[in-house]
Structures are given as C-alpha cells and as structure tokens.
C-alpha cells in the first residue's frame, strides 16, 4: 500500500507533494534572516530567534508551537577581562600577546556582541611554563611523546592543532598528562585548503580567523548541574566542583598568525616524523621550552572567563499523527550559534524551517501524517548539546515508549562534494529508497539520481555498488536519543571530498566569518545542495511518519552485528597468548548474532506476509521494530559513561565525534598491554563481551514471535 | 623584483576626470589584492580603496566611493584609479600597492604618481 | 572610522640610539597594525606587519610589540639610513586607517 492510504486522503498528498513543496529560494531566505546578527545561547538575541521560529511555525499551520525552558551552566568570556596568551620574558614583562578578536568580515563591521573567540567552560588561570607541541593531542600523539621520545608534560602548557578528534578529548588527553594549561589552534595544513583564497574572497582561514567552542567531557550528561534530570525551576544543582566533564586547567584558542609567533620559537625535540608537521614556516619542534636565544621567555595564559547558570529556550513543535498520534517521528536541529552560524546551524535550521512550511502547507489542505511529527529547534547546542538532553531527560519516559525516529538537522553542509549520512543500520534501506527516488544536483549527474551520484562519489568499503554509511558518533543532538534513549537515529548532509580535502571539518568553522555570504558565495549558491539536504531530511521523516509499516530493515542490523563482531574479534586477537592464559572466548557473541541474523530473517519474512489491514497486528509489528533500538540498551550503561547506554554504539572515547562499535569490548581491549593487572582486564574483556552477547540476543529475542 | 610603476599624473582641471594605472611586474598579479594610497603634499597617507583579486570586490574610503572606480586586469598586469568630479582636495601622490589578502598589509609600493587638481 | 594617533610627529635620535615611536587606535584593532617607512624622496616600504612581524628583507635591528589599542616600533640601533618618517596602519577594518606619522631626524 502507498504512504497515503493511511490517513485517507487524496494521492495529491503524498511524498511528492511534500517535496515538490520545497523550495531552494525558500531556505536561502531564511538562511539570511537567521544569520544577521550573532544567536549565542542564553542570550538575549537568542531568545527573541526563539520567540520568531515559535510564531513562524504556528504561521506554517502546526498544531501547537512551544518553548521549553531550563537553567543549565553555561560560560562566556569577562567582557572587561579579555583572554590572551602572552611570551614573557625573564623578567616577567609581556614581549608578545595574542589577538584578543577577531578581525570583522565585510559587512559586519558594526555588528555588536560578537564573543571573542573562548574555549567554553574553561577555568579562570594564568599559568606560565613551558611550551610542549603535541600535534592534535589525540591518545597516540601522547603515547609517542611519552613512551617513545620520553618527553614529560607535567607541568607544562600544551599547544595543539585542532583537527581529527573533538577538542574535548584534547584537552582531557592534556590534562591526564598533567599539563597547567592548553593552547588551541587552527594550523593551515588543516584549515586552509590549497589553491582556495580566504575569506572574504574564498572559504579558507584567514590566519586572525579563530575557531570556538566547548572542552566539556560530559559523555552525555547534558547539564553539568543537573546529570539525568531536566534543569527545571526545582532542580537540585550540584555544586561547581562536582559538576560532571568540567576541564581543570585553563584552555584557549587562537589562530595560525598568533600560533606562528609560539611555534616560531619552539626548542627541544625535533618534530618525530612528517605527520607532527603542519604548514606553518616554523620547525614544529615539540619541545620543551624555546630555542637558545629564547630559552628563558616562558608562555603565560590569562583566562577570566566565568562559568553561569543561564536560561535557554528550545522551541518544540508539534504536528499531530492522524491515526498513531502517541507515535512520535522527531525532526530536530540546532538554534544558537557560536557567532552568526552561516554554516553551524543555520544552514540546518534554514532547512528545518522549510521542511516545517512545507509540512504546514499540506496540512492546511486537510491532510495530516499518520504519527505524530515532533519539530524542535534546540537551544544551547554548542555548549556540551544541553537543550536537546534537557528536553529529553525531561520527556525520557514519553520518549521511551513512543518515539519511533529522530532525525538530525544541525548544518545542511561541511562542502558541495556528495550526500554524507550517519544512522542506525535500520534506516540503511530508507536511506537507499529516498535517495534513489531524489535528483542528484551534482555537476555531471544532471538526469541521474542522488543514489548514483552518491555511491560513485563515496562508495561503501563493503558492498559495490552501495554508497557508504557511517556509524553514529556524537558531537550533535541525537545524542541522547540514540545513545541514551535508544531512539533510532539518522543525519545527513552535503560534504567534501574526503580524499581530496584533508582539512579537518571545514576551514571556517566556529569562526566569525561563518557567514551568510560563506554560503551564497562559496558553498551554495543556488542553494541546490541545501534543497537536496531538505528532501533527505525531509523524506526520511515523511516515510517515518507517515508509512503504514515503519521503514526499517532488522536484517541491515544483523549484517552489521556481524561485521562489528568479526573487526573487535581481530582486535583480541593480537593478544592470542593472553586470550589462551585468561579462556577469553567470543563464540557467546558469535552465537548470539548468528541468532539475531536467524530471528531477524524470519521477522522479514512475516513482515512481507502479514494482515496490514489488521491494525493490532500492524500495531505489533511495527511495535517489535519501533522498540529493537532501544533492546540494545543497558540500564547500567558502559562503564565510567553511564549516559552512554548503547552496547552496539557509542562515541569513541578519544574522539567524541567518531562512532566506536562494541565500544565496552573495544575499550576494555584498548591499551590492555600496558595495564599493570593483565588479570583483571582480561577479566573485564570477557565480562564485556559477555554483556554484548546477552544484549544482542536478548535484542534478537525482541523480535521472535510473540507467542 | 617586485615593481609596480604607476602612470604618469598630471594637472587636471576640477570637475574633470583622469585615469591612472600601475604596471604589476615581477610576482603573479591575480594572487594579491591591490590598493591605491594617497598623500597629500606635507600630509599623512590615506587610504584610496583596494580591490581583491578577481576584481569581483572592491572597497572605498567612503567619501570618495561615488567619485573613484578601482579595477584591475589580470590578463595585462594593470591596476587602475578612475576618478571623475575631481576636487582642489584630490590633489595628492598617489601610491598603487600590493596587499596578500583582505586584512594583509601593503607590502610593496610604487614610487608615487603626482596629481594636482586646479583651475 | 578607527583613528591611528601617533602622539610624537617628530623625533630627534643619535646614531646607534635605540628609538621607539608609538601608535595609538581609538578601538582594540586586535594585532592588525603595520608599519611603513617613507624616505625623504617619497618611497614607502613595509617594515613590519601583524604587530611584531618582521617583512623580508628588513634590518632585524626593527622590531614591533603592542596588542589592543596600544602599539610601537623600535630600532634597536640607529643607522644614518634609517632616517625617514613613519607611519603605523591599521588593518582590522574599514576603511584602512594611518597614523600622522613620526618623522626621525638625526640629532
């Protein structure tokens, strides 16, 4: 049966007619009108942007648009107390002092309140020492530094390049190699892409241009104040010493002109190969300390910023299911921004809006979806993604038992290459069909289906002729509904050519010139990639909410289960001797997903037969696929992150943004040579695997038939 | 060698108008933006306008913005400064120079080109 | 419009002097701040840019420090070819602004 017998309504209303609503023109207009001025959270520019979306969306013709407010802890710089770094010399005097802003772009000259660039929730310091150069301050940089080149942090402020892993795990790898201080920065090897201009006359970095943003380690806690309940009116608060993923030493960033200047004078090491170099003219020594001349110049931070309990406002929409209204598809993205948000979030948001609009259109003309459609624009994303966790700490039960999707819409674009989707291997086929159905807008493709130009593009490493998908990590808001609520999840986006572009993310996020312009100049003029993001984003919720069978495929599942099985079992198995001393077996996990794959392949089967004009039935089916992404949920979490409650899925725990599969097995191998009680972490091994085993064959269970 | 020589300036006539350029040679002129400064006799130096490398851009000191076009020919090496409704007050040196993008400075100058504008 | 004040128009040194000429803005310009020599016949070089960076092929006996609003040139070592006026330059917005200038004379 189509789509639109479910609510009886006239086949004009169908997935087509929702996205032939969508318009590029549209979503570039609203990209405009939100990127004028800054939206920080918990501001006041932020809370009236709130107040607009919440009266556009009612205009559009939802049901009902409300904002949901909460107290979390949020940190900005002292407006009479600038942060900067500074070179002294012998005798205590600033020789050299880092920028305190950012040079405006055109255009913007006179725009007020725009936050100088912060590292958010650092703490108040003003440490001196010597300089250590740790590359990205990834796991492996500081097991080469001090394993192999015996070079102690202890003591020391640590400069590191932004890029491959999230800055929060930086900057906790700094503090557990003891360092009193970090320093970020953007190196141009990562931030400036060769034979492109910077900005504003191309999408490069210019050496003032600075990136922002959090060094939490909040592993999914949302409120540092408030872990596992919403930061309402009664909430009780932790005090600021027991709040959860604060950074203990003071943290700031600055650009690769300010950056030169400190690595210029570099002493000690030598870089220990190519892959410590970045593009900079300067020798990328690691250290200690400066070169001869300047040996007895130190570097001394000055951090001021506060941390605050402020108000933020996410605003939630509603659009009412006609037949599965306790059913709930959501469609959510990113409000504030950490100056004017060209790319991060408003591209998303832009998208959002029009996605909403063209909802709103066709429910005027009488239709409805078959569940409900939750709409939600989330409010202090940037700050450790506290809106999203708020509401949904504060709705968990709700949720629980009636979401059926969520659907991620933060940035509609990194770049202009090819489709990028992450999502639970339940949506690979939805995923595949829609795209499949959508035009490519890409050059080259014209006639073709996004399907084509997707996979030519960015093909799967498993499976020819299929585009890759990838793991859900974090760093976004589906977060806490896939990790913790197990709530199945997706995103998509245009992006780069990875193979080509090296640079990490793109060059001009979090800065102040993520603008407007950025986009309608650099990106996407014809805002053809932003309309193709909305018909992604848009259709996957359309089919979520509004099929008869819900649209996801267990058996995708069980391939994966599979894959993911094989990949941690080569992993142990570069320990054969301690896997033989300790009986470290995997045959119950081997056992339990040749079960799910067996259960699975039966559940498909019956799917395919059963009554669909039976509602208790459907009910049912549908119910056994809503609920198989939260089976693989442990109530007790993984060990030490006990938000992160997926066993199949959880971010990597030394890079936030990056999905690790079985990550209580992988964690538990992780470094497992280097552990003083071999016998104890073994044990720990086999007690993960143990608990993989059992979830997916207690999720594999979720699916036999009922009686 | 770095050089950038500018046309030959002159007395003009207030009200009218006068076209100069500056010759680029010795580096690619499509990589930089350029500029024109100019000096008063006995005076400070103020900023013209400049123009990015494309040409698609270009920025004015404001008073002078309806009155002066800055453009520039890649394919020739030419920058040029159009002014028209020239003014006793537009009577200056005027330096053409090479800026590395929109926030860099001018790292290489012309020698100068006097224009005197008087009845 | 930012306005660059350099408070000493003219400076008198003797050779081998170490001379510093200063920079004012009316607002933090955030380390955008050049600094260019003009000899008596009128030519103009680029001696430092970004506040304390040294351009090619300058003397390293000129040297820049400053951040904010607040900014100055040094010549460790006065030489006779050093006399010449100077002008700091700010770069952080429109319209790019310039200072007076300081001219040096040798005592």
């Known amino acids: 049966k189509s789509s639109n017998e479910a609510t009886n309504i006239t086949p004009k209303h169908n997935m087509k007619a929702f996205l032939d609503e969508l318009k590029a023109e549209n979503i570039k207009k609203f990209l405009y009108n939100f990127t004028q001025i800054p939206h920080l959270a918990g501001t006041e520019q932020n809370f009236q942007l709130a107040k607009q979306i919440q009266s556009q969306w009612k205009e559009f013709g939802l049901d009902s648009v409300e904002l949901a407010h909460y107290d979390v802890l949020l940190s900005y710089p002292n407006k009479t107390h600038p942060n900067y770094i500074s070179i002294i010399n012998e005798d205590g005097n600033e020789i050299f002092n880092t920028s305190l802003f950012e040079p405006p772009p055109p255009g913007y000259e006179n725009v007020s309140d725009i936050v100088p660039p912060f590292s958010a929730f650092s703490p108040q310091g003003m440490p001196e020492g010597d300089l250590v150069y740790v590359n990205y301050a990834r796991t492996e940089d500081f097991f080469k530094l001090e394993r192999d080149m015996k070079i102690n942090c202890s003591g020391k402020i640590v400069i590191a390049r932004y890029g491959k892993v999230f800055r929060g795990n930086k900057v906790k790898n700094a503090q557990l190699a003891g360092a009193k201080g970090v320093i970020l920065y953007s190196d141009p090897a990562d931030y400036f892409a060769p034979g492109v201009k910077s900005y504003p006359d191309g999408w490069n970095l210019p050496g003032g241009g600075v990136q922002r943003g959090n060094i939490l380690n909040l592993n999914g806690a949302g409120d540092p104040l408030t872990p596992g309940y919403p930061a309402n009116e009664y909430a009780y608060r932790r005090g600021i010493a027991e709040a959860v993923g604060l950074p203990s030493i003071p943290v700031h960033p600055i650009g690769y002109y300010d950056a030169q200047k400190l690595l210029e004078k570099m002493g000690g090491s030598a870089p220990p190969d190519s892959s410590w170099r970045g593009s900079l003219k300067v020798p990328y020594n690691v250290g200690p300390g400066f070169t001869g001349n300047f040996s007895t110049q130190k570097v001394k931070m000055h951090i001021h910023s506060t941390n605050e309990v402020t108000r933020i406002y996410n605003v939630i929409g509603t659009l009412r299911g006609a037949v599965e209204p306790d059913r709930y598809v959501i469609l959510g993205g990113h409000r504030d921004s950490w100056v004017f948000g060209g790319i991060d979030p408003q591209s998303g948001a832009a998208v959002v809006h029009e996605i909403v609009r063209s909802f709103g259109t066709l429910k005027k003309e009488g239709w409805r979806p078959r569940r409900t459609i939750l709409f939600a624009s989330w409010d202090a994303e940037e700050f450790g993604l506290l809106g999203s966790t708020e509401w949904a700490e504060e709705n968990s039960r709700l949720l629980q038992e009636r979401g059926v999707a969520y659907i991620n819409a933060d940035s509609s674009i990194e770049g202009n290459y090819t489709l990028r989707v992450d999502c639970t291997p339940l949506m690979y086929s939805l995923v595949h069909n829609l795209t499949k159905e959508l035009k490519s807008p890409d050059e080259g493709f014209e006639g073709k289906s996004l399907y084509e130009s997707w996979t030519k593009k960015s093909p799967s490493p498993e499976f020819s002729g299929m585009p890759r998908i990838s793991k859900l990590g974090s760093g976004n808001d589906f977060e806490v509904f896939f990790q913790r609520l197990g709530i199945a999840s997706g995103r998509a986006r245009y992006t780069k050519n990875w193979e080509t572009n090296k640079f990490s993310g793109y060059p001009l996020y979090h800065s102040v010139y993520e603008t407007y312009e950025l986009v309608e100049k650099f990106y996407d003029p014809m805002f053809k990639y932003h309309l193709t993001v909305a018909q992604v984003r848009g259709g996957m919720v359309f089919e979520l909410a509004n099929s008869i069978v819900l649209p996801f495929d267990c058996r995708d599942y069980a391939v994966v289960l599979r894959k993911y099985a094989d990949k941690i079992y080569s992993i142990s198995m570069k320990h054969p001797q301690e896997m033989k001393t300790y009986s470290v077996s995997f045959d119950s996990l081997f056992s339990a997903v040749k079960n799910f794959t067996e259960i699975a392949s039966k559940f498909s089967e019956r799917l395919q037969d059963f009554d669909k004009s039976n509602p208790i039935v459907l009910r049912m089916m549908n119910d056994q696929l809503m609920f198989l992404e939260r089976a693989f949920i442990d109530p007790l979490g993984l060990p030490d992150r006990p938000f992160y409650r997926h066993v199949i899925y959880a971010p990597s725990s030394h890079n936030k943004y990056a999905g690790e599969s079985f990550p209580g097995i992988y964690d538990a191998l992780f470094d497992i040579e280097s552990k003083v009680d071999p016998s104890k972490a073994w044990g720990e091994v086999k007690r993960q695997i143990y608990v993989a085993a059992f979830t997916v064959q207690a999720a594999a269970e979720t699916l036999s038939e009922v009686a | 060698e770095v050089k950038l020589v500018e046309s030959e300036g002159g007395l003009v006539q207030p009200g009218s108008s006068m076209k100069l350029s500056c010759t680029a040679s010795?580096?690619?002129?499509?990589?930089?933006?350029m500029a024109w400064v100019r000096q008063v006799p006995e005076r400070g130096l103020e900023w013209v306008a400049n123009?990015?490398?494309?040409?698609?851009?270009?920025y004015y000191l404001d008073s002078l913005k309806s009155r002066f076009i800055i453009s520039r020919d890649n394919a020739k090496n030419i920058l040029y400064l159009q002014m028209s409704s020239l003014k006793s007050e537009d009577t200056a040196t005027y330096y053409c120079?090479?800026?590395?993008?929109?926030?860099?400075?001018?790292?290489?100058w012309g020698q100068g080109t006097s224009v005197t504008v008087s009845s | 419009d930012i306005q660059m004040t350099q408070t000493t128009s003219s400076l008198s040194a003797s050779l081998g002097d170490r001379v510093t000429i200063s920079c004012r803005a009316s607002?933090?310009?955030?380390?955008?701040l050049n600094w260019y020599q003009q000899k008596p016949d009128g030519t103009v070089k680029l001696l430092i840019y970004?506040?304390?960076s040294l351009h090619s092929g300058v003397p390293s006996r000129f040297s820049g420090s400053g951040s904010g609003t607040d900014y100055s040139l040094t010549i460790s070592n006065l030489e006779q070819e050093d006399i010449a006026t100077y002008f700091c330059?700010?770069?952080?917005?429109?319209?790019?602004?310039f200072g007076g200038g300081t001219k040096l004379e040798i005592k």
């Open positions: 120079a090479r800026g590395g993008d929109y926030w860099d400075a001018m790292d290489y």
């Open positions: 010795g580096f690619t002129f499509s990589d930089y933006y």
């Open positions: 123009i990015n490398y494309d040409g698609s851009s270009t």
């Open positions: 607002q933090d310009i955030s380390k955008y």
């Open positions: 970004y506040t304390s």
């Open positions: 330059q700010q770069g952080n917005r429109l319209p790019r602004t």
